[in-house]
């Protein structure tokens, strides 16, 4: 080019449809030039022009050559120059925001711009770049990068940013600029000018103002707060602690808090001081509701569902920034609120549903809500499946007879299409309960019966009820306890029946023991004895409760005696026993000892025995007739335990084994024995029957039976030199060696002669006696053997 | 814990000087504003100065005005009461309290006797 | 300055009883109020703040309210631990100013 000629063409675009080409003009040339500008393209195009600028239209990929001729005054120049796509330039336009505003309850900038689309002809990427600026020096908060994507018509665009701090703090500015990332265009591509600024800012009133006001923030989170004031701020804090200032446009000042913990429950304070007062505010730092925890649903009465959860974490919020929480149920789209003032039992909360006609399965959710967020659970239920029925009321207990009842009881609810399994709680006083189980049909009028059998006559009964569902979820709670006497019934056995021989031989005695409860069926009045023969049947008067026993004068003949017990109902059966034992010859009379507690007695199988066995016992030094008690064994025993409280250790009994055939009875064996043996009370009485020069003769008395206080097992006899009154040893005291002893363990051996003694001698005697007890006490003697003749 | 521990009390003659020292230990001292407080025997609470929590800002009751001074040394958690020009009327149990507006913690206080 | 009135300077109550406590302040203190109580040969002890908040540990017996110029303190059933002496103060403004304190004793 030469110099003087149009130099430095540069060419831009800002659709990609247009370039816009300016050049510099020839030095020296003045107002009055005119350009020729010819473009060589297919057709070869020239523009007269009196500016140094041209638009064109963009041309396709390749090189052209540009030829600018400059006419002024004097001369002409001529310029060529080769353009390419690649030499141009893409600008935008400078955007234009359409509206900035804001929220300022949550501290949000919201921004508009249209990014003019419609003059591109490709779909293009369009990078934007926002500024936020604050306060009047305009400091740089944020600069961030937005894509769009240009689509050949005018599109509106929307962004907004939340501010850390609260808008009402300090003038916010926003400023936009673009890049149009263009695939189609391989020329240099740089941003747009930046748009004109706009600004947000909050017109205070004439008060002083802390912002956020009343904030609900998250536990941990950071957050700034601010003064907007008139005066001078001298100081801000948080609980009782001070934060640093930092100083925003004017008196205006903010606060940081990072990290915020969890507030109690009337919030944390924030406040800021000037010197003559406090201005403040209160932020309220929690949790987002927990996932409803344990969330279960069932009903009582298939009217209502009752729905329960536990909300899980506290969330340190309450009043109106409390969780509320939405029970939905979707299959219907019925929902139910809980409202707060049902404060929750026990940590858990409730909410009730109506059931709705012919809608078994329910689908329900939880929804949980606060200001910091929201969480939900789901439970699917069948609530057929799921009924916990009420505690059962009005429990009544009926007789139908003396072994049925019939129960009686309240359950509210609409039932009809389940069934109930109940179980009855039965006790009997004094033993272990029993439970039955029951299924029922399921009522609509919640009125429910039962009949119970299998009870026992006049039997105190404690009954209660409880009940769930065949399919079982729950059982209700237990109904209240009724107690309940069944009717009287006859009794079952007559009574256990035995008879004596008066001593003198002449009466029958007739000893009867009182029906168990379990037997008797009732409260026994009176019994019935009679006694019958071959000939004829005798029937004594009528003997009223308690009176066991009855006397009847018989002769030696066989006859049978028959005991009845009588209740309101009717009578027992006989009780049956001859008068007359079976005789037994070859008896002897055996020795037993027991256990401490009782004694144990066998025997030998005996088929002939075909009722029963019976053993009697008595006191030995009780006189006859001898009956303390007796015990009935089955026919199939062959031993038994006898234990009564009335026996005492070192007393001795007798024991009698009888064998019972057709109501007779036989005495199988006859034992004397002790529970327990104890050691002789008193030492045998013993005398000197005789004495010579070298011996003595001693003879002694047995001891009484109760005195004794076992079996005897033998006597123990000691001798030795000893004097009466004399300081000399006695002969029990131990380290003598002269003292001889004799064991007799013959028992029936009475007296004993003591030889080989020295003549003119006093000798010390000692008798004692032993059972397997222990040895008695002793009882002593002195004696002088004669002189030698 | 929070602790503070007054020191530095004890009998002096009026027109003397005495200086009272509380240790702050357990929390973040230069988090928090300072307060002396006094309670003469038998009479009610007194407050006498505050000091902010930078030492920045320091106040006093009018009738320690001029004779007394707080300050505060943040690098050994210490807060400082110096007494000038003692009056009888000084007499009291001297507390050391945290918190600028509101006294959330108090030493068990020191006995400042002032008498002839 | 602000001046802090008590009322009554004495109140004789049995356990069990229901205690109410009356400040007054010379001029509109807002909320700006706290109370404190405190036993023989002991420092003063932080229960309320801002008139009605509760300081963390104190028993949910204790509770305030009132503002401008008139607060109560109300203690709803008096334990034996709070015959003590009560005193209330504003803190709106410098210089802090107590109130003359209330002595709750055993009847």
């Known amino acids: 080019q030469k110099k003087g000629a149009p130099h430095d063409l540069k060419c831009v675009t800002n659709n990609l449809q247009v370039w816009d080409c300016y050049w510099k003009a020839p030095s020296g040339t003045g107002r009055g030039t005119d350009y020729e500008v010819c473009i060589e393209n297919r057709s070869h195009s020239c523009y007269q022009l009196e500016k140094t600028n041209i638009k064109i239209p963009a041309l396709s990929h390749g090189d052209y050559e540009i030829t600018i001729n400059s006419l002024h005054d004097f001369g002409s120049s001529t310029s060529k120059f080769t353009l390419n796509e690649q030499n141009v330039s893409l600008i935008p336009d400078t955007p234009e925001i359409l509206n900035l505003s804001a929220d300022f309850s949550t501290s949000t900038l919201y921004l508009k711009w249209n990014d003019r689309g419609s003059v591109f002809p490709h779909h293009s990427n369009v990078i934007w770049e926002i500024k936020i600026l604050r306060k009047e020096s305009m400091e740089l908060v944020k600069l961030v990068t937005h894509n769009t994507t240009l689509n050949g018509k005018d599109t509106l665009h929307h962004w907004s940013w939340a501010s850390d701090m609260p808008l009402e703090c300090a003038i916010h500015f926003v400023e936009i600029r673009c890049y149009i990332d263009s695939l189609h265009f391989s020329g240099r591509k740089e941003w747009s000018d930046w748009s004109p600024v706009k600004n947000i800012s909050w017109m205070p009133d004439s008060q002083t103002k802390v912002f956020p006001q009343d904030k609900v923030i998250l536990v941990g989170s950071d957050i700034t707060f601010c003064c907007i004031s008139q005066e001078k701020v001298l100081s801000a804090l948080i609980g009782h602690t001070n934060c640093p200032l930092i100083h925003l446009d004017g008196e205006n000042v903010a606060i940081k808090i990072h990290n915020i913990s969890v507030s109690a429950s009337s919030g944390t304070n924030v406040v800021f001081t000037t010197e003559d007062n406090i201005f403040g505010t209160v932020i309220f730092a929690g949790y987002p509701p927990d996932t409803p925890q344990q969330l279960n649903c069932e009903t009582h009465d298939l009217k209502e569902i009752l729905c329960r959860w536990n909300p899980g974490r506290a969330t340190a919020l309450v009043g109106p920034r409390a969780t509320s929480y939405t029970l939905l149920e979707s299959f219907s789209g019925k929902y139910v609120r809980f409202k707060r003032a049902e404060a929750p039992t026990n940590g858990s909360y409730q909410l009730f549903f109506q059931m709705l006609p012919n809608q078994e399965i329910y689908n329900f959710t939880l929804n949980a809500h606060n200001p910091l967020g929201r969480s939900e659970s789901t439970i699917l239920v069948n609530i057929t499946e799921k009924v916990y029925p009420h505690t059962p009321t009005s429990f009544k207990v009926k007789d139908i007879n003396s072994t049925a009842v019939k129960l009686s009881w309240h359950l509210p609810g609409n039932f009809a299409k389940i069934n109930f399994l109940c179980q009855i709680e039965i006790k009997k006083s004094n033993t272990v309960q029993e439970q039955r189980n029951v299924t029922i049909k399921g009522v609509e009028n919640s009125s429910y019966l039962v009949a119970l059998d299998k009870l026992n006559p006049y039997t105190v009964y404690t009954f209660r009820i409880r009940c769930s569902t065949e399919t079982f979820w729950k059982w209700s709670k237990w109904s209240n306890k009724k107690q309940h006497l069944t009717t009287e019934a006859i009794p079952s056995k007559g009574p256990d029946t035995w008879r004596e021989w008066s001593s003198d031989g002449k009466n029958l005695i007739i000893y009867w023991k009182p029906l168990p409860i379990n037997e008797a069926n009732g409260k026994i009045l009176s019994y019935n004895v009679s006694c019958s023969s071959d000939e004829e049947t005798q029937s004594l008067s009528e003997i009223p409760d308690p009176q066991h026993k009855a006397e009847i004068q018989l002769d030696k003949n066989d006859y049978i005696i028959s005991v009845v017990a009588k209740n309101s109902v009717g009578s027992s059966p006989p009780s049956k026993i001859a008068s007359m034992e079976i005789p037994n010859d070859d008896l002897k009379i055996e020795q037993v000892v027991g256990m401490g507690k009782g004694i144990l007695l066998t025997w030998h199988y005996d088929p002939n025995m075909t009722c029963d066995y019976v053993i009697k016992w008595c006191n030995s030094s009780r006189s006859e007739p001898c009956l303390m008690d007796w015990r009935k064994v089955p026919s199939n025993s062959t031993e038994t335990v006898i234990e009564s409280d009335q026996f005492r250790p070192g007393v001795r009994y007798n024991f009698f084994l009888y064998g019972c055939r057709n109501q007779g009875y036989q005495l199988l064996r006859s034992m004397i024995g002790y529970i327990e043996e104890l050691a002789p009370t008193v030492a045998p009485n013993f005398t000197v029957e005789d004495t010579s020069a070298d011996s003595i003769l001693v003879k002694w008395e047995d001891i009484p039976v109760e005195e004794l206080r076992g079996f005897l097992r033998g006597y123990l006899f000691y001798f030795g030199k000893g004097e009466r009154d004399t300081s000399k040893m006695r002969v029990l005291e131990s380290g003598r060696s002269d003292i001889k002893v004799k064991n007799i363990t013959d028992i029936s051996q009475k007296t004993l002669r003591i030889a080989d003694l020295q003549g003119k001698t006093s000798y010390h005697l000692v008798l004692r006696a032993y059972t397997d007890g222990g040895v008695g006490p002793e009882k002593s003697m002195y004696v002088v053997t004669k002189e030698n003749s | 814990q929070v602790q503070l521990v007054e020191s530095g009390g004890g009998v002096v003659q009026p027109g003397r000087s005495l200086r009272l020292s509380c240790a702050a230990s357990g929390f973040t001292f230069s988090s928090y504003g300072m307060n002396w407080v006094r309670q003469a025997p038998g009479k009610g609470l007194e407050w006498v100065a505050v000091?902010?929590?930078?030492?920045?800002?320091?106040y006093y009751a009018d009738s320690v005005k001029g004779r007394f001074t707080i300050s505060r040394d943040n690098s050994k958690n210490t807060l400082y009461l110096q007494m000038n020009s003692l009056r009888a009327e000084d007499t009291a149990i001297y507390y050391c309290?945290?918190?600028?507006?509101?006294?959330?913690?108090w030493g068990r206080g020191t006995l400042v006797t002032v008498s002839s | 300055d602000i001046q802090m009135t008590q009322s009554p300077s004495t109140l004789s109550a049995s356990v069990g009883d229901r205690v109410t406590i009356t400040c007054r302040a010379s001029q509109s203190i807002s909320s700006w109020l706290a109370w404190y109580q405190q036993k023989p040969g002991k420092a003063p002890n932080l229960l309320m703040y801002?008139?009605?908040n509760l300081e963390n540990g104190v028993s949910s017996r204790f509770s305030g309210s009132g503002s401008g110029t008139e607060f109560t303190l109300t203690i709803t059933s008096l334990q034996p631990d709070d015959f003590a002496t009560y005193y209330c103060?504003?803190?709106?403004?410098?210089?802090?100013?107590f109130g003359g304190g209330t002595k709750v004793e055993i009847k």
């Open positions: 103060q504003q803190y709106k403004s410098n210089p802090l100013t």
């Open positions: 801002k008139a009605s």
């Open positions: 000091i902010w929590f930078d030492g920045s800002i320091k």
């Open positions: 309290a945290r918190g600028q507006l509101v006294q959330d913690f």
